[in-house]
């Protein structure tokens, strides 16, 4: 197993609709054809998997149907979008990239993106 550099933004603010997007870029040392991208969340001394997708270079990322993540790939960049976020989901979201094929296996872990989620205030009742 070999190490690989992964870059991601330090901070992202989720939209009022609970959507956050960020780019995960990895420095591929070779010509990988199969890549696995995993989004992890670190909070309260625990790391949990948010979502994961394996894709062939040049093809779209495919997350499970019930995943809260969507994404697109372009070269060594993955554009990730996480939906359905609420204030309690605020935390450090880490991009983990694995070059699965061909060998050798490479593993890269980003420094994490702190995603802040603010629940929208309910609209006051209107007379109109």
């Amino acid at each position: 197993c070999k190490a690989m550099h992964v870059a991601q933004p330090a901070v992202v603010l989720a939209s009022s609709r609970g959507i956050a997007s960020f780019v995960c870029e990895y420095a591929s040392p070779g010509k990988a054809t199969e890549v696995r991208v995993t989004v992890l969340r670190q909070a309260d001394s625990q790391v949990t998997e948010v979502c994961a997708a394996t894709y062939m270079m040049g093809n779209e990322l495919t997350f499970l149907d019930d995943s809260i993540c969507t994404g697109t790939s372009s070269g060594n960049q993955v554009n990730l979008t996480i939906q359905g976020l609420r204030a309690m989901d605020t935390g450090l979201y880490i991009c983990k990239v694995e070059l699965m094929y061909p060998p050798p296996y490479y593993l890269g872990i980003g420094n994490g993106t702190q995603i802040y989620v603010i629940d929208p205030e309910p609209c006051p009742d209107s007379d109109f």
């Epitope: 670190q42 001394s45 625990q46 450090l92 872990i109 420094n111």
Partner: nanobody, 126 residues
């Protein structure tokens, strides 16, 4: 809250083997840096081995190199310390320790640890 629990200690003859296990209750050890320390009667506590959060880096004290092996079993949420060719001087209470570092340090062992288990006694004697 995560708690660490050691198991696998016991009495073994010189040259024998033991397999210590460090498990987490109340959470997982995924990506935690885990260390094994030991303390013999009348001696200072010493770090025996550690494994990084990714499992790619392992360190060993000179006194156990080539005899002890640390590994992660993420499917069982445990960290194993396999101890072979045990000697009388390995007799001690063995403690599992852990810390969840920032992701930038997941490939390294921690310099200090937040959590400590209660310890398990290892006695090497004929």
């Amino acid at each position: 809250e995560v708690q660490l629990v050691e198991s696998g200690g016991g009495l073994v003859q010189p040259g024998g083997s033991l397999r210590l296990s460090c498990a987490a209750s109340g959470g997982t050890l995924d990506y935690w840096s885990i260390g094994w320390f030991r303390q013999a009667p009348g001696k200072e506590r010493e770090e025996v081995s550690c494994i990084s959060g990714t499992g790619l880096r392992t360190n060993y004290a000179d006194s156990v190199k080539g005899r002890f092996t640390i590994s992660r079993d993420n499917s069982k949420n445990t960290v194993i310390l396999q101890m072979n060719s045990l000697r009388a001087e390995d007799t001690a209470v063995y403690y599992c320790t852990g810390k969840l570092l920032h992701p930038s340090l997941w490939s390294a062992c921690a310099n200090e640890y937040d959590l400590w288990g209660q310890g398990t006694q290892v006695t090497v004697s004929s």
